[in-house]
Each structure stands twice: as C-alpha cells, then as structure tokens.
C-alpha cells in the first residue's frame, strides 16, 4: 500500500435494476482489477422532486477524478444524474452534493433505498 492512500477492497453494492439484471439489490462488492490500477467506490443517484433515488453503487476502476477522495461528493452543478466516487473501503455508503459554483444544502445519506 502507498502511504497516505486508502486502499479500496470492497464497496457498498446497490442496483436499482436488480430484477432486470438478475442481481442482488444491495450487498457488498469486492473490488478487483489489475495490480497497477487504483480502485474506487462510486454512487449514482437522482433527485426526483427532493426525493433521493439511488441508481447504482459499487466498485469503480482507476479514475483520476476519484484519486485521494475519502468522501463521495458530487460537485457538478445540478446534473440530471448525480455521480460521486471515492477511495477507501465502503466509502460510498454515504454520499453528498456540494456544487462548487454555489452554496447549497448537501444530500445527506445513507439513504434507505425504496423497496421494489
């Protein structure tokens, strides 16, 4: 392990399309990849009239946009679909929204996914 870097070995898994994809809806996903690749966790969600709907959570492979992020934070201003990534085991359990442009309220989590 490189000093100061969080090694990601597993992430929270969620799939809103679990029935169609024949997966579990929630769980823990072990993160794999080549030894020279960094591993991350991610979360993707939507904000439907103030209600948070998680789309996906899981492992994400070697993306410079995720390097050294211990928290999963979306910084884009008002995206249609929110995305964040981070480094560290299960770091995608909580995710938030802090756009860089303006002061906003965070989307605090964990969020209980709506039952299918």
């Amino acid at each position: 392990a490189i000093l100061g870097r969080s090694e990601t070995q597993e992430c929270l898994f969620f799939n809103a399309n679990w029935e169609k994809d024949r997966t579990n809806q929630t769980g823990v996903e072990p993160c794999y990849g080549d030894k020279d690749k960094r591993r991350h966790c991610f979360a993707t969600w939507k904000n439907i009239s103030g209600s948070i709907e998680i789309v996906k959570q899981g492992c994400w492979l070697d993306d410079i946009n995720c390097y050294d992020r211990t928290d999963c934070v979306e910084k884009k201003d008002s995206p249609e679909v929110y995305f964040c990534c981070c480094e560290g085991n299960m770091c995608n359990e909580k995710f938030s929204y802090f756009p860089e442009m303006e002061v906003t309220q965070p989307t605090s989590n964990p969020v209980t996914p709506k039952p299918p």
């Epitope: 690749k37 899981g58 492992c59 410079i64």
Partner: antibody, heavy 120, light 107 residues
C-alpha cells in the same frame, strides 16, 4: 499478458445449438466479470451477455434472453455461451471480453472472436 | 434502451490531422462512456473508459471528454496506425449499447 481465446464457432442450422468457449490466461480469471459481444458481418458491435466474477449475477440482451446461457468455470479459467434455438440473425463473430466490476463495464481485453454462421 | 448516436459515420483525414468524433446518448449516462478502436478482421481495443480515462498502453494523442449525454473522442495528431473504426459504448444501464461506429479513412 492477458489472453482470451474463443472456440466452438461454426456452421449450424436454424433451430440448432452451439456452445462457445473462451479460455482465459494471464490474469486472475475468478476476479473479473466476463462478457460476450457479437458483430454481424459488416455491422457494428452488439452486447450479448455478462456474468460476474462468481456467477452470482448474469444479464442478457433481450434478443437472446431465454435462448442463450452465459456461464463460467473458474477452476478451468473458462467462460461459456450456450446458444440454443439459433436463428439466421445470430450469425456473427462472437467475442469474449473481460471487465473488472459489475457496474463498471468497460471491456478492457477482448478475444480474437469465433464465427457463428446460422444457415440451412 | 439507451441509444448511442455517433457522428460522423465516416471521415477522411490525413496523417497529422486533429480528428474529433462525437457520441450522443439518448439520456444522461453521467461518465459511463467508453471508446474502442477496431481494425478490419481484428477484435476491438479499449482506448478510453469512464469518458476521460486513458487505458493502459494507449498513446496520449487519444483523449476523451464529456459527461451527461455528449461525449467526444479526440485524436490530436492522426498517425498511420489510427485509420480504423471507432465505437462508443455506454455502461450506465443494461443492455450495454454501442454507437454505430465512425470509420476514419485516409484522405
């Protein structure tokens, strides 16, 4: 070096069956999701099916659902595609390809492909 | 299903040219966008994943940009070995879908 080698293609009559295999080497096969992608002659790429590292999850294109079955044997480092009730429109080169994680489906290494021809 | 539309479907360019290929998704796919290169009779090769990340061993003249619905693959200085067909692919949702391809030919 990552290597994926498909086999099992050939000529088959409509309604017939084939089983494709993909032998993997040069990486820890049991740690990767695997996928089948096909390409009809002169056409673009079409995803067929995916399976996760431990066979817990599988997913299929609507065009093959109920006819094709993706499976793997991690002890043999081999991926399979069982193709039943084959149709003329299934004629294509079939590629196996690996991906690291279930949701992060970029296909980083591909086999050379095996041609399946469905014709009477 | 998410539709992926590539443009142009073909283009002619010279060695040294800057080439741009665009890919548009029918709905937001965030950064779940990958680019592949395929030469005749060969398997596709991954160039760019997660919209902007360069795959191992791919020359730095290839770059990707975009998020949401609009994405771009740029070849900063076209080389003789770059004449091929390029495909985008979304991995935001199943079924995974590819663009129709862009054939880059020698002018």
């Amino acid at each position: 070096e990552v290597q994926l080698l498909e086999s099992g293609g050939g000529l088959v009559q409509p309604g017939g069956s084939l089983r494709l295999s993909c032998a993997a080497s040069g990486f820890t096969f049991s740690s990767y999701s695997m996928n089948w992608v096909r390409q009809a002659p002169g056409k673009g790429l079409e995803w067929v099916a995916s399976i996760n590292y431990n066979s817990g999850y599988t997913s299929y294109a609507d065009s093959v659902k109920g006819r094709f079955t993706i499976s793997r044997d991690n002890s043999k480092n081999t991926l399979y595609l069982q193709m039943n009730s084959l149709r003329a429109e299934d004629t294509a080169v079939y590629y196996c390809a690996r991906s690291a994680n279930w949701h992060d489906t970029h296909l980083d290494y591909w086999g050379q492909g095996t041609l399946v021809t469905v014709s009477s | 299903d998410i539709q992926m539309t590539q443009s142009p479907s073909s283009l002619s360019a010279s060695v040294g040219d800057r080439v741009t290929i665009t890919c548009r998704a029918s709905q937001s796919i965030v950064s779940y966008l990958n680019w592949y290169q395929q030469k005749p009779g060969k398997a596709p090769k991954l160039l760019i994943y997660a919209a902007t990340s360069l795959h191992s061993g791919v020359p730095s003249r290839f770059s990707g940009s975009g998020s949401g619905t609009d994405f771009t693959l740029t070849i900063s200085s076209l080389q003789p070995e770059d004449f091929a067909t390029y495909y985008c692919q979304q991995s935001y949702d199943t079924p995974l879908t590819f663009g129709g391809g862009t054939k880059v030919e020698i002018k």
